[in-house]
Protein backbone atom coordinates (compact mmCIF):
# COMPACT_ATOMS: atom_id res chain seq x y z
CA UNK A 1 0.00 0.00 0.00
CA UNK A 2 1.60 3.24 -1.16
CA UNK A 3 1.30 6.44 0.90
CA UNK A 4 -0.14 9.54 -0.73
CA UNK A 5 3.35 11.05 -0.93
CA UNK A 6 4.69 7.93 -2.68
CA UNK A 7 1.75 7.94 -5.12
CA UNK A 8 2.41 11.59 -5.86
CA UNK A 9 6.11 10.87 -6.47
CA UNK A 10 5.21 8.05 -8.91
CA UNK A 11 2.79 10.35 -10.77
CA UNK A 12 5.45 13.03 -11.05
CA UNK A 13 8.02 10.56 -12.33
CA UNK A 14 5.62 9.14 -14.93
CA UNK A 15 4.82 12.62 -16.23
CA UNK A 16 8.54 13.38 -16.47
CA UNK A 17 9.09 10.29 -18.59
CA UNK A 18 6.84 11.64 -21.34
CA UNK A 19 8.30 13.75 -24.13
CA UNK A 20 7.23 17.28 -23.30
CA UNK A 21 7.99 20.87 -24.07
CA UNK A 22 7.33 22.71 -20.87
CA UNK A 23 7.76 26.37 -19.96
CA UNK A 24 10.61 26.93 -17.56
CA UNK A 25 12.45 29.54 -15.58
CA UNK A 26 15.30 30.94 -17.65
CA UNK A 27 16.56 33.47 -15.12
CA UNK A 28 16.18 33.89 -11.40
CA UNK A 29 13.46 36.36 -10.40
CA UNK A 30 14.47 39.57 -8.68
CA UNK A 31 15.76 38.96 -5.12
CA UNK A 32 16.55 35.29 -5.89
CA UNK A 33 20.19 34.21 -6.08
CA UNK A 34 21.32 31.73 -8.68
CA UNK A 35 23.22 28.68 -7.50
CA UNK A 36 23.91 26.43 -10.48
CA UNK A 37 20.52 25.29 -11.80
CA UNK A 38 18.55 26.70 -8.86
CA UNK A 39 17.31 30.05 -7.65
CA UNK A 40 17.48 30.54 -3.88
CA UNK A 41 15.69 33.06 -1.70
CA UNK A 42 17.05 33.58 1.81
CA UNK A 43 14.36 34.85 4.17
CA UNK A 44 15.20 37.63 6.59
CA UNK A 45 12.27 37.02 8.90
CA UNK A 46 11.84 33.98 11.15
CA UNK A 47 9.22 31.25 11.29
CA UNK A 48 8.71 27.70 12.55
CA UNK A 49 9.38 25.02 9.94
CA UNK A 50 5.71 24.52 8.89
CA UNK A 51 5.19 28.24 8.27
CA UNK A 52 8.43 28.37 6.30
CA UNK A 53 7.19 25.50 4.15
CA UNK A 54 3.94 27.38 3.54
CA UNK A 55 5.74 30.62 2.72
CA UNK A 56 7.82 28.96 0.02
CA UNK A 57 4.65 27.48 -1.41
CA UNK A 58 3.07 30.94 -1.71
CA UNK A 59 6.16 31.99 -3.66
CA UNK A 60 5.61 29.09 -6.10
CA UNK A 61 8.73 27.39 -4.75
CA UNK A 62 9.71 24.84 -2.12
CA UNK A 63 11.93 24.68 0.93
CA UNK A 64 15.48 23.96 -0.14
CA UNK A 65 16.33 20.41 -1.20
CA UNK A 66 20.04 19.56 -1.07
CA UNK A 67 21.22 16.77 -3.37
CA UNK A 68 24.69 16.17 -1.97
CA UNK A 69 27.52 17.53 0.14
CA UNK A 70 28.85 19.62 -2.73
CA UNK A 71 25.55 21.47 -3.07
CA UNK A 72 25.46 21.95 0.71
CA UNK A 73 28.89 23.60 0.67
CA UNK A 74 27.95 25.89 -2.22
CA UNK A 75 24.75 26.90 -0.41
CA UNK A 76 26.62 27.55 2.83
CA UNK A 77 29.02 29.80 0.92
CA UNK A 78 26.08 32.13 0.26
CA UNK A 79 25.36 32.45 3.99
CA UNK A 80 27.23 35.53 5.13
CA UNK A 81 26.51 35.50 8.85
CA UNK A 82 27.92 32.73 11.05
CA UNK A 83 25.19 33.02 13.68
CA UNK A 84 22.15 32.62 11.41
CA UNK A 85 20.28 29.34 10.90
CA UNK A 86 18.00 28.55 7.93
CA UNK A 87 15.35 25.84 7.62
CA UNK A 88 15.63 23.47 4.67
CA UNK A 89 13.11 20.94 3.33
CA UNK A 90 14.07 18.01 5.56
CA UNK A 91 12.34 16.76 8.68
CA UNK A 92 12.09 13.60 10.79
CA UNK A 93 9.44 11.11 9.79
CA UNK A 94 8.29 9.35 12.95
CA UNK A 95 6.45 6.60 11.05
CA UNK A 96 9.55 5.72 9.01
CA UNK A 97 12.05 6.67 11.70
CA UNK A 98 14.20 8.47 9.18
CA UNK A 99 15.00 11.91 7.85
CA UNK A 100 12.70 12.66 4.93
CA UNK A 101 12.91 15.35 2.27
CA UNK A 102 9.69 17.19 1.44
CA UNK A 103 9.70 15.55 -2.02
CA UNK A 104 9.22 12.17 -0.31
CA UNK A 105 12.78 10.84 -0.62
CA UNK A 106 14.90 9.82 2.33
CA UNK A 107 18.21 11.30 3.35
CA UNK A 108 21.30 9.46 2.18
CA UNK A 109 23.26 9.13 5.42
CA UNK A 110 26.46 10.23 3.69
CA UNK A 111 25.05 13.52 2.38
CA UNK A 112 24.75 15.60 5.55
CA UNK A 113 26.47 15.33 8.90
CA UNK A 114 23.65 16.31 11.23
CA UNK A 115 24.35 17.69 14.69
CA UNK A 116 21.59 16.78 17.13
CA UNK A 117 18.97 14.12 17.61
CA UNK A 118 16.83 12.30 15.07
CA UNK A 119 13.48 12.33 16.84
CA UNK A 120 9.86 13.41 16.64
CA UNK A 121 9.25 17.09 15.79
CA UNK A 122 12.80 17.56 14.55
CA UNK A 123 13.57 19.54 11.43
CA UNK A 124 16.85 20.37 9.75
CA UNK A 125 18.54 23.74 9.58
CA UNK A 126 21.81 24.81 8.07
CA UNK A 127 24.29 27.49 9.03
CA UNK A 128 27.41 28.79 7.36
CA UNK A 129 29.37 25.83 8.70
CA UNK A 130 27.03 23.11 9.98
CA UNK A 131 23.78 21.16 9.72
CA UNK A 132 21.56 20.99 12.80
CA UNK A 133 18.53 19.11 14.06
CA UNK A 134 16.19 21.62 15.71
CA UNK A 135 12.69 21.50 17.14
CA UNK A 136 10.38 22.27 14.22
CA UNK A 137 8.67 24.91 16.35
CA UNK A 138 11.87 26.94 16.60
CA UNK A 139 11.56 30.27 14.81
CA UNK A 140 14.49 30.77 12.44
CA UNK A 141 14.99 31.91 8.84
CA UNK A 142 14.51 29.64 5.84
CA UNK A 143 15.60 29.12 2.23
CA UNK A 144 13.20 28.69 -0.67
CA UNK A 145 14.24 27.23 -4.02
CA UNK A 146 13.01 27.34 -7.60
CA UNK A 147 14.45 25.10 -10.31
CA UNK A 148 15.98 26.79 -13.33
CA UNK A 149 14.99 25.02 -16.53
CA UNK A 150 15.39 25.90 -20.21
CA UNK A 151 12.30 27.28 -21.93
CA UNK A 152 12.46 24.55 -24.57
CA UNK A 153 13.27 21.46 -22.60
CA UNK A 154 12.62 18.14 -24.34
CA UNK A 155 12.51 15.37 -21.79
CA UNK A 156 13.02 11.79 -22.96
CA UNK A 157 12.53 8.57 -21.02
CA UNK A 158 15.61 7.60 -19.03
CA UNK A 159 17.48 10.71 -20.11
Amino acid sequence: QKSSIEKCSVDIQQSRNKTTERPGLLNCPIYWQQLREKCLLFSHTVNPWNNSLADCSTKESSLLLIRDKDELIHTQNLIRDKAILFWIGLNFSLSEKNWKWINGSFLNSNDLEIRGDAKENSCISISQTSVYSEYCSTEIRWICQKELTPVRNKVYPDS
Epitope: I30, Y31, H44, L78, R80, D81
Partner: antibody, heavy 116, light 107 residues
Protein backbone atom coordinates in the same frame (compact mmCIF):
# COMPACT_ATOMS: atom_id res chain seq x y z
CA UNK B 1 12.86 50.85 16.01
CA UNK B 2 14.89 50.82 12.79
CA UNK B 3 15.95 54.27 11.58
CA UNK B 4 17.68 55.26 8.35
CA UNK B 5 19.58 58.45 7.62
CA UNK B 6 20.86 59.57 4.22
CA UNK B 7 23.96 61.73 3.97
CA UNK B 8 26.01 63.21 1.15
CA UNK B 9 26.44 66.35 -0.93
CA UNK B 10 23.30 68.21 -1.92
CA UNK B 11 24.86 69.63 -5.06
CA UNK B 12 26.64 67.66 -7.80
CA UNK B 13 28.02 68.97 -11.09
CA UNK B 14 26.86 67.48 -14.40
CA UNK B 15 28.95 64.50 -15.61
CA UNK B 16 30.26 63.89 -12.07
CA UNK B 17 29.37 61.05 -9.71
CA UNK B 18 26.65 61.34 -7.08
CA UNK B 19 27.60 59.57 -3.82
CA UNK B 20 25.22 59.02 -0.91
CA UNK B 21 25.47 56.96 2.27
CA UNK B 22 22.65 55.51 4.36
CA UNK B 23 23.33 54.81 8.03
CA UNK B 24 21.07 52.25 9.69
CA UNK B 25 20.45 52.46 13.44
CA UNK B 26 18.23 50.50 15.81
CA UNK B 27 18.92 47.20 14.04
CA UNK B 28 21.54 45.27 12.14
CA UNK B 29 22.09 45.74 8.43
CA UNK B 30 23.01 42.05 8.16
CA UNK B 31 20.52 39.64 6.63
CA UNK B 32 18.29 42.27 5.06
CA UNK B 33 17.91 43.75 1.62
CA UNK B 34 18.47 47.51 1.38
CA UNK B 35 17.32 49.76 -1.45
CA UNK B 36 17.69 53.23 -2.86
CA UNK B 37 14.65 55.01 -4.33
CA UNK B 38 14.42 58.49 -5.77
CA UNK B 39 11.55 60.90 -6.36
CA UNK B 40 11.31 63.61 -8.99
CA UNK B 41 8.40 65.89 -9.87
CA UNK B 42 8.54 64.60 -13.45
CA UNK B 43 9.01 60.82 -13.06
CA UNK B 44 7.61 60.31 -9.56
CA UNK B 45 9.00 57.47 -7.45
CA UNK B 46 11.69 55.39 -9.10
CA UNK B 47 13.44 52.36 -7.61
CA UNK B 48 17.21 52.52 -8.16
CA UNK B 49 18.44 49.17 -6.82
CA UNK B 50 19.10 46.92 -3.83
CA UNK B 51 22.01 45.27 -2.04
CA UNK B 52 22.00 42.08 0.07
CA UNK B 53 25.18 41.69 2.13
CA UNK B 54 27.79 41.97 -0.58
CA UNK B 55 26.73 38.80 -2.41
CA UNK B 56 23.73 40.07 -4.32
CA UNK B 57 22.65 43.34 -5.90
CA UNK B 58 20.12 44.30 -8.55
CA UNK B 59 19.54 47.59 -10.33
CA UNK B 60 16.78 49.30 -12.27
CA UNK B 61 17.50 48.42 -15.93
CA UNK B 62 17.17 52.08 -16.93
CA UNK B 63 19.98 53.08 -14.54
CA UNK B 64 22.02 49.88 -14.43
CA UNK B 65 25.01 51.15 -16.44
CA UNK B 66 25.53 54.07 -14.05
CA UNK B 67 24.67 52.63 -10.62
CA UNK B 68 26.71 50.90 -7.94
CA UNK B 69 25.33 50.04 -4.49
CA UNK B 70 27.71 48.75 -1.84
CA UNK B 71 27.46 47.82 1.83
CA UNK B 72 29.71 48.15 4.87
CA UNK B 73 28.28 45.85 7.53
CA UNK B 74 30.92 46.90 10.09
CA UNK B 75 29.60 50.48 9.95
CA UNK B 76 25.95 49.47 9.44
CA UNK B 77 25.91 51.54 6.25
CA UNK B 78 25.17 51.12 2.58
CA UNK B 79 26.00 53.50 -0.22
CA UNK B 80 24.87 54.66 -3.64
CA UNK B 81 27.08 55.84 -6.49
CA UNK B 82 25.46 57.21 -9.65
CA UNK B 83 27.90 58.22 -12.36
CA UNK B 84 27.66 60.68 -15.27
CA UNK B 85 24.80 62.62 -13.72
CA UNK B 86 22.64 65.11 -15.60
CA UNK B 87 19.93 67.55 -14.55
CA UNK B 88 17.44 64.66 -14.92
CA UNK B 89 19.06 63.02 -11.86
CA UNK B 90 18.01 65.94 -9.64
CA UNK B 91 15.71 64.30 -7.10
CA UNK B 92 15.01 63.50 -3.48
CA UNK B 93 16.94 60.29 -2.77
CA UNK B 94 15.62 57.86 -0.17
CA UNK B 95 17.21 54.79 1.36
CA UNK B 96 14.87 52.07 2.63
CA UNK B 97 14.77 48.61 4.13
CA UNK B 98 13.59 46.28 1.42
CA UNK B 99 11.26 43.41 2.35
CA UNK B 100 12.09 41.67 -0.94
CA UNK B 101 10.09 44.07 -2.99
CA UNK B 102 8.27 46.49 -0.73
CA UNK B 103 9.74 49.01 1.69
CA UNK B 104 8.84 49.11 5.37
CA UNK B 105 11.37 51.60 6.74
CA UNK B 106 12.50 54.74 4.90
CA UNK B 107 15.00 57.49 5.52
CA UNK B 108 13.65 61.04 5.52
CA UNK B 109 15.20 61.68 2.11
CA UNK B 110 17.91 64.03 0.87
CA UNK B 111 17.59 66.44 -2.03
CA UNK B 112 20.38 66.20 -4.58
CA UNK B 113 20.57 68.92 -7.22
CA UNK B 114 22.63 68.46 -10.36
CA UNK B 115 23.82 71.83 -11.56
CA UNK B 116 26.99 73.56 -12.63
CA UNK C 1 8.51 46.95 -17.52
CA UNK C 2 5.11 46.91 -15.84
CA UNK C 3 3.46 50.33 -15.98
CA UNK C 4 1.05 51.16 -13.14
CA UNK C 5 -1.72 53.68 -13.83
CA UNK C 6 -3.50 55.18 -10.84
CA UNK C 7 -6.92 56.77 -10.96
CA UNK C 8 -8.32 59.20 -10.29
CA UNK C 9 -5.43 61.67 -10.23
CA UNK C 10 -7.18 63.64 -7.49
CA UNK C 11 -10.00 62.58 -5.19
CA UNK C 12 -11.89 65.34 -3.34
CA UNK C 13 -13.70 63.99 -0.31
CA UNK C 14 -14.83 65.00 3.17
CA UNK C 15 -13.73 63.43 6.46
CA UNK C 16 -15.86 60.40 7.26
CA UNK C 17 -16.39 59.52 3.60
CA UNK C 18 -15.16 56.37 1.88
CA UNK C 19 -12.21 56.62 -0.52
CA UNK C 20 -11.66 54.12 -3.33
CA UNK C 21 -8.36 54.34 -5.18
CA UNK C 22 -7.56 52.32 -8.29
CA UNK C 23 -4.27 50.97 -9.61
CA UNK C 24 -4.17 49.25 -12.99
CA UNK C 25 -1.14 47.32 -14.28
CA UNK C 26 -0.13 47.09 -17.95
CA UNK C 27 0.34 43.34 -17.46
CA UNK C 28 -0.52 40.82 -14.77
CA UNK C 29 1.32 41.33 -11.47
CA UNK C 30 2.78 37.99 -10.36
CA UNK C 31 1.45 36.54 -7.09
CA UNK C 32 -0.36 39.80 -6.23
CA UNK C 33 2.98 41.41 -5.45
CA UNK C 34 1.54 44.88 -5.03
CA UNK C 35 2.05 47.44 -2.25
CA UNK C 36 0.40 50.74 -1.32
CA UNK C 37 2.07 53.75 0.30
CA UNK C 38 0.89 57.02 1.81
CA UNK C 39 2.99 60.17 1.45
CA UNK C 40 2.50 63.54 3.10
CA UNK C 41 4.32 66.72 2.03
CA UNK C 42 7.98 66.77 3.10
CA UNK C 43 7.85 63.16 4.34
CA UNK C 44 8.96 59.79 3.03
CA UNK C 45 6.32 57.33 1.81
CA UNK C 46 4.83 55.07 4.48
CA UNK C 47 3.97 51.45 3.77
CA UNK C 48 0.26 50.68 4.17
CA UNK C 49 -0.39 47.41 2.31
CA UNK C 50 1.76 44.64 0.83
CA UNK C 51 0.84 41.48 -1.04
CA UNK C 52 -2.20 43.38 -2.37
CA UNK C 53 -4.20 42.91 0.85
CA UNK C 54 -1.95 42.50 3.92
CA UNK C 55 -1.83 45.50 6.23
CA UNK C 56 1.61 46.62 7.37
CA UNK C 57 2.41 46.80 11.08
CA UNK C 58 0.57 49.60 12.87
CA UNK C 59 -1.74 50.47 9.98
CA UNK C 60 -5.38 51.09 11.07
CA UNK C 61 -7.97 48.64 9.79
CA UNK C 62 -9.83 51.38 7.91
CA UNK C 63 -7.19 50.82 5.22
CA UNK C 64 -7.77 47.74 3.08
CA UNK C 65 -6.36 46.46 -0.19
CA UNK C 66 -7.84 44.10 -2.73
CA UNK C 67 -7.41 42.87 -6.28
CA UNK C 68 -5.23 40.58 -8.35
CA UNK C 69 -3.87 40.28 -11.86
CA UNK C 70 -4.03 43.76 -13.35
CA UNK C 71 -6.62 45.53 -11.18
CA UNK C 72 -6.01 46.58 -7.59
CA UNK C 73 -7.88 48.80 -5.15
CA UNK C 74 -7.03 50.64 -1.95
CA UNK C 75 -10.06 51.47 0.17
CA UNK C 76 -10.15 53.86 3.12
CA UNK C 77 -13.46 53.03 4.76
CA UNK C 78 -13.86 56.28 6.68
CA UNK C 79 -11.49 59.16 6.03
CA UNK C 80 -9.81 60.71 9.04
CA UNK C 81 -8.22 64.19 8.83
CA UNK C 82 -4.74 62.62 8.82
CA UNK C 83 -5.57 60.48 5.77
CA UNK C 84 -5.47 63.36 3.30
CA UNK C 85 -2.26 62.71 1.38
CA UNK C 86 -0.90 61.22 -1.84
CA UNK C 87 -1.18 57.45 -2.28
CA UNK C 88 1.09 55.34 -4.48
CA UNK C 89 0.84 51.74 -5.63
CA UNK C 90 3.98 49.74 -6.39
CA UNK C 91 4.46 46.32 -7.96
CA UNK C 92 7.32 43.97 -7.17
CA UNK C 93 6.47 40.95 -9.28
CA UNK C 94 8.76 41.98 -12.14
CA UNK C 95 11.48 44.43 -11.25
CA UNK C 96 9.94 47.30 -9.24
CA UNK C 97 7.77 50.13 -10.50
CA UNK C 98 5.50 52.74 -8.89
CA UNK C 99 2.27 54.30 -10.00
CA UNK C 100 1.96 58.05 -10.54
CA UNK C 101 -0.08 58.59 -7.39
CA UNK C 102 -3.57 59.66 -6.34
CA UNK C 103 -3.99 62.79 -4.26
CA UNK C 104 -6.77 62.58 -1.68
CA UNK C 105 -7.72 66.15 -0.77
CA UNK C 106 -10.29 67.72 1.51
CA UNK C 107 -13.45 68.75 -0.33
Amino acid sequence: QVQLQESGPGLVKPSETLSLTCTVSGGSISGYYWSWIRQTPGKGLEWIGYIYYSVSSNYNPSLKSRVTISVDTSKNQFSLRLSSVTAADTAVYYCARDETGYFDYWGQGTLVTVSS
Amino acid sequence: EIVLTQSPGTLSLSPGERATLSCRASQSVRSSYLAWYQQKPGQAPRLLIYGASSRATGIPDRFSGSGSGTDFTLTISRLEPEDFAVYYCQQYGSSLTFGGGTKVEIK
